[in-house]
């Protein structure tokens, strides 16, 4: 019997009946065994077929077989109900070998020409399986010449049998307080030949509870306990299971914070598996009772390990732990069933005793010493000499712990000295220099420091004076000896003040005329206002109406008198304002340089002379009565004049204060 060619030679060829294409003889038996390489099969088809037809091909036939299986027995020329001829059919070996047997019997009724066939080896596609047959591979099948291989989806690994995909289902750790876990692919069938390990690991103090949910289907056996596939649950205390079959296992209360779930499957079966919903519990903490004027959030039926609550206080109350304020409060339940911090209090906001008001007082309105939320206090200023600036003095204790005015201000009100009060009333006529009486000029300030000069008190910590009077001390403010509240220049009874800083107008040039002859002295402490020490008012916008030509102003000071000496007692003189052009003309002639009198100056005095300010009065105030407010204000600052004070046809020249209101206000607000 001839054999087919041996691989690796090409496996293909031709087969024919003996004597083909002539008729075949009787009593012939011929056998061919064709062999292909592993992973290949043989394909065979006939190009000519002419054999004696007999019932079930008993006489002459060609038989094709592969291994023990007969693929076909062929005879005749065309197929009938009971006999088969190859026609155009192609035949395939089942493995890599194909046996072909030709036989003729002892007689033929007529001549038959036999057969001619061709064969070739071809790759087997192992990945193609007939319907109803098990697939070659669990997941993916890859055919190649001479063979195939299997691969798996993500999350699986190829078993050593090279066909099954085992699930990579170990090492998952669940740390949340509740969750779900299930067999791989649930609710689809779970994979074969897999060993899965799941861990639930919660903080110490928690106890895991397992509930099997939805469905449970694990391969079982009627007599033996879970011999094929099984589920086991292990804690540090005990083991539960194995579980299999179709009945949902009961709830398992593990009383453990760690659980290991093992699921093992064999190579066969088609079951949907299982799903577990797990929860946890722990020793509950005492139910938190909110402190008075507070509330707990969130509200829960019970609080267990890791649960927390916060306390929020009502408006006007603040969290206190002991006496210490807390920004927020959150307590956490511990594993021993206790809270990690003690409950705070919601204590009513206490604004505390209100600050003392300089030159004022405070009165408790709500009740004596009551300083808690919504309490009301009333500030007021010392009558007569102080007045409250901006607000009405009513303050309420607000939720932020601050005393707050009706305008929302948290700063204290200010008791501002009342300005321009004088014991003196003007007679409205000109008369000679007079001795001042107590309270006549309570703004009068005596400035000693090299020379004698004067100034006027503004507010309770500023002195308005002439630049030329303090120019030498501008860099040594502390050298100025400032006295007030006295009439007698040499009296030991006076209120002492010291300078913190001297501010000379930037437009003033020393020894080059007296334009911008104005300065401010900041005192290092506020002075106490009384009938003998009261500030002068600054001019209002409307003040010019009280400072027209011939309106009377009053100058005061300890300057030279007609006798040529500094006055012992404070003196004053009432003098009229002089027409500006008239004054300018008076100082146009020598020895005065042109332009001595500027728009920043005003003049006052008598044309006939005799009433004037003089050396030593420098820096003092020329004051006017504002008849609308009934307050005295400073209209001029004693600046300069003729060499001979009180000279006829010459006038005292004063710095025009109204021109400097913005400058004064800026300095005072900035410093």
């Amino acid at each position: 019997t001839p054999l087919g060619p041996k691989w690796p030679e090409p496996v293909f060829g031709r087969l024919a009946s003996p004597g083909f294409p002539g008729e075949y003889a009787n009593d012939q038996e011929r056998r061919w065994t064709l062999t292909a390489p592993p992973g290949y099969r043989l394909r065979l088809y006939f190009t000519h077929f002419d054999l004696e037809l007999s019932h079930l091909c008993e006489y002459d036939f060609v038989k094709l077989s592969s291994g023990a299986k007969v693929l076909a027995t062929l005879c005749g020329q065309e197929s009938t109900d009971t006999e088969r001829a190859p026609g155009k059919d192609t035949f395939y070996s089942l493995g890599s070998s194909l046996d072909i047997t030709f036989r003729s019997d002892y007689s033929n009724e007529k001549p038959f020409t036999g057969f001619e066939a061709f064969y070739a080896a071809e790759d087997i596609d192992e990945c193609q399986v007939a319907p109803g047959e098990a697939p070659t591979c669990d997941h993916h099948c890859h055919n190649h010449l001479g063979g195939f291989y299997c691969s798996c989806r993500a999350g699986y690994v190829l078993h050593r049998n090279k066909r099954t995909c085992s699930a990579l289902c170990s090492g998952q750790v669940f740390t949340q307080r509740s969750g779900e876990l299930s067999s791989p692919e649930y609710p689809r069938p779970y994979p074969k030949l897999s060993s899965c390990t799941y861990s639930i690991s919660l903080e110490e103090g928690f106890s895991v509870i397992l509930d099997f949910v939805e469905s449970f289907d694990v391969e079982t056996h009627p007599e033996t306990l879970c011999p094929y596939d099984f589920l086991k649950i292990q804690t540090d205390r005990e083991e539960h299971g194995p579980f299999c079959g179709k009945t949902l296992p009961h709830r398992i209360e593990t009383k453990s914070n760690t659980v290991t779930i093992t699921f093992v499957t064999d190579e066969s079966g088609d079951h949907t598996g299982w799903k577990i919903h797990y929860t946890s519990t722990a020793q509950p903490c005492p139910y938190p009772m909110a402190p008075p004027n507070g509330h707990v959030s969130p509200v829960q039926a019970k609080y267990i390990l890791k649960d927390s609550f916060s306390i929020f206080c009502e408006t006007g109350y603040e969290l206190l732990q002991g006496h210490l304020p807390l920004k927020s409060f959150t307590a956490v339940c511990q594993k021993d069933g206790s809270w990690d911090r003690p409950m705070p209090a919601c204590s009513i906001v206490d604004c505390g005793p209100p600050d003392d008001l300089p030159s004022g007082r405070v009165e408790y309105i709500t009740g004596p010493g009551v300083t808690t939320y919504k309490a009301v206090i009333q500030y007021s200023c010392e009558e007569t000499f102080y007045t409250m600036k901006v607000n009405d003095g009513k303050y309420v204790c607000e939720a932020d712990g601050f005393w707050t005015s009706s305008k929302g201000e948290k700063s204290l009100p200010v008791c501002e000295p009342v300005c321009g009060l004088s014991a003196r009333t003007t007679g409205g006529r000109i008369y000679g220099g007079q001795k001042a009486k107590p309270g006549d000029f309570p703004w009068q300030v005596l400035i000693l420091g090299g020379t004698t000069a004067a100034g006027a008190l503004l507010y309770d910590n500023w002195v308005l004076t002439a630049a030329h009077a303090v120019y030498e001390q501008k860099h040594d403010a502390s050298a100025l000896d400032i006295r007030m509240g006295t009439l007698k220049r040499l009296s030991p009874h006076y209120t002492q003040a010291w300078s913190e800083a001297v501010f000379i107008h930037e437009g003033y040039t020393h020894d080059a005329g007296f334009d911008n002859d104005i300065a401010l002295i900041k005192l290092n402490n506020k002075v106490v206002i009384n009938s003998n020490i009261t500030p002068i008012c600054l001019p209002r916008k409307e003040a010019e109406s009280f400072m027209r030509t011939d309106d009377i102003g009053t100058a005061s000071g300890w300057g030279l008198t007609q006798r040529g000496f500094l006055a012992r007692n404070l003196m004053y003189v009432d003098i009229p304002i002089v027409d500006h052009q008239k004054c300018t003309a008076a100082y146009e002639k020598p020895p005065y340089p042109r332009g001595s009198v500027t728009a920043n100056m005003l003049c006052a005095g008598l044309e006939s002379g005799g009433k004037d300010s003089c050396r030593g009065d420098s820096g003092g105030a020329l004051v006017f009565l504002d008849s609308e407010t009934e307050r005295w204000f400073v209209g001029g600052i004693v600046s300069w004049g003729s060499m001979n004070c009180g000279e006829a046809g010459q006038y005292g020249v004063y710095t025009k204060v109204i021109n400097y209101i913005p400058w004064i206000e800026n300095i005072i607000s900035d410093f």
Epitope: H323, P325, S328, P353
Partner: antibody
Framework: QVQLQESGPGLVKPSETLSLTCTVS??????????WGWIRQPPGKGLEWIGS???????YYNPSLKSRVTISVDTSKNQFSLKLSSVTAADTAVYYC??????????WGQGTMVTVSS | SYELMQPPSMSVSPGQTASITCSGD??????AYWYQQKPGQSPVLVIY???KRPSGIPERFSGSNSGNTATLTISGTQAMDEADYYC?????????FGGGTKLTVL
């Protein structure tokens, strides 16, 4: 305005007990609004809270000093006191008393220097 | 034990803004307090409960506190602001001070 004044010996021997008193004027030590505290400051160094007391006698102490510190109050004299036992040179400091209103120290006393030396 | 960290020193020109920091673990969850101490003088409270200013303290002093850092800000710094500044907080009912920052006004 409330004022505080510390008093006590300026020199203490090692291993002895340091005793200081703080006298409160211009306000009552029995006010429910306040605790009263002690703070110290070693030369050239920072501040260290020692402890605070309420007029009822309730106290808070710095854990690092707790074993050696006693703070007491005498409401009749409007005073509170500090005792620090087993002193060493490390306890040399300016000791301040202060009013403690809900955790904020205001005002403070002028401070008293205590030297620990033999 | 709880610690508050401050830079030992910093300098600022007059009129400029000085920002002094104080850091501690979750400091923003608790209140911070700030004290000013001039040489030879007792400390003075300048800011309490993070951002509140006691009466008598100029408006140029302000405070903030979040995360791990509290900040004292002095805007328009003046020569008189030259001093040591200490932050303070209460942690578990224990008073803790920072090491202090020496502010120099150039």
């Amino acid at each position: 305005q409330v004022q505080l004044q510390e008093s006590g010996p300026g020199l203490v021997k090692p291993s002895e007990t340091l005793s200081l008193t703080c006298t409160v004027s211009g306000g009552s030590i029995s006010s429910s609004s306040y605790y009263w505290g002690w703070i110290r400051q070693p030369p050239g160094k920072g501040l260290e809270w020692i402890g605070s007391i309420y007029y009822s006698g309730s106290t808070y102490y710095n854990p690092s000093l707790k074993s050696r510190v006693t703070i007491s109050v005498d409401t009749s004299k409007n005073q509170f006191s500090l005792k620090l036992s087993s002193v060493t040179a490390a306890d040399t400091a300016v000791y301040y008393c202060a009013r403690d209103r809900r955790g904020r120290f205001d005002p403070w006393g002028q401070g008293t220097m205590v030297t620990v030396s033999s | 034990s709880y610690e508050l960290m401050q830079p030992p020193s910093m300098s600022v020109s007059p009129g400029q803004t000085a920002s002094i920091t104080c850091s501690g673990d979750k400091l923003g969850d608790i209140y911070a307090y700030w004290y000013q101490q001039k040489p030879g003088q007792s400390p003075v409270l300048v800011i309490y409960q993070d951002n509140k200013r006691p009466s008598g303290i100029p408006e140029r002093f302000s405070g903030s506190n979040s995360g791990n850092t509290a900040t004292l800000t002095i805007s328009g710094t003046q020569a008189m602001d030259e001093a040591d500044y200490y932050c303070q907080a209460w942690e578990s009912s224990t008073g803790v001070f920072g090491g202090g920052t020496k502010l120099t006004v150039l």
